[in-house]
């Protein structure tokens, strides 16, 4: 669980998510898992003042 060295990147750097299609990167254990196993933030209501969050968990293209 989140063990070993990890390089720190700039805030806008892409998340290094070497996952196969249909898998997502679990940020909390730093591993690729089936996307359905992860719960994402609640969607913003329409017209919310805060922009939609940029996700680091989308499946690899």
């Amino acid at each position: 669980m989140r063990r070993g060295p990890r390089s720190l990147r700039g805030r806008d750097a892409p998340a290094p998510t070497p996952c196969v299609p249909a898998e997502c990167f679990d940020l909390l254990v730093r591993a690729c898992v089936a996307c359905g196993l992860l719960r994402t933030p609640r969607p913003k209501p329409a017209g919310a003042s805060s922009p939609a969050p940029r996700t680091a968990l989308q499946p690899q293209e």
């Epitope: 909390l28 898992v33 680091a56």
Partner: antibody
Framework: EVQLQESGPSLVKPSQTLSLTCSVT????????WNWIRKFPGNKLEFMGY???????YYNPSLKSRISITRDTSKNQYYLQLNSVTTEDTATYYC???????????WGQGTTLTVSA | DIVLTQSPVSLAVSLGQRATISCRAS??????????MHWYQQKPGQPPKLLIY???DLESGIPARFSGSGSGTDFTLTINPVETDDVAIYYC?????????FGGGTKLEIK
Amino acid sequence: EVQLQESGPSLVKPSQTLSLTCSVTGDSITRGYWNWIRKFPGNKLEFMGYINYSGTTYYNPSLKSRISITRDTSKNQYYLQLNSVTTEDTATYYCATPHTYGAMDYWGQGTTLTVSA
Amino acid sequence: DIVLTQSPVSLAVSLGQRATISCRASESVDDYGISFMHWYQQKPGQPPKLLIYRASDLESGIPARFSGSGSGTDFTLTINPVETDDVAIYYCQQTSKDPWTFGGGTKLEIK
């Protein structure tokens, strides 16, 4: 909407074992992370540990080998067991679930535990 | 463990004014281009409520009076303007490294 509800004793004697249950509705505990957090009388919050979608557990090292978190997926419940309690374990115990960044957006109402002889 | 130090410990602000709460981490909580820092509000007899996640993202349903900023080791929660309903204790939390930790809390009162 995910809902969590803690249940368990309100009073435990020193050296006994504390057992708490978190009952979850609105989502399956086979996805996501399922945490235990406690708040001490002085307002300090402590993350105790979690069990996740795969059944993997993580425990705060401050609790050493006293803690165990388990689950029953058929009941959609998860459990906290804390052994050898002392008066220092007097606190309000919460179950909570975070989203992908670890931010806990759903919490139970909390159950207050007093450890006293 | 990453230690989160909040300041001030308590804060009294006039209605309609700005409240600023600081959270300093003992080491960076940034990884993968993300700040793993979150803010909660807790009122007596209630569980904590998530306000801000990932340093600056407003949780769904939270008024835009609340905002978060910062990266690395220094983070700020701002409430502007402060309303009566904002009287509470505010906590920062990091989930960058095990074990996840919370700040000691900042108590907000109305002047």
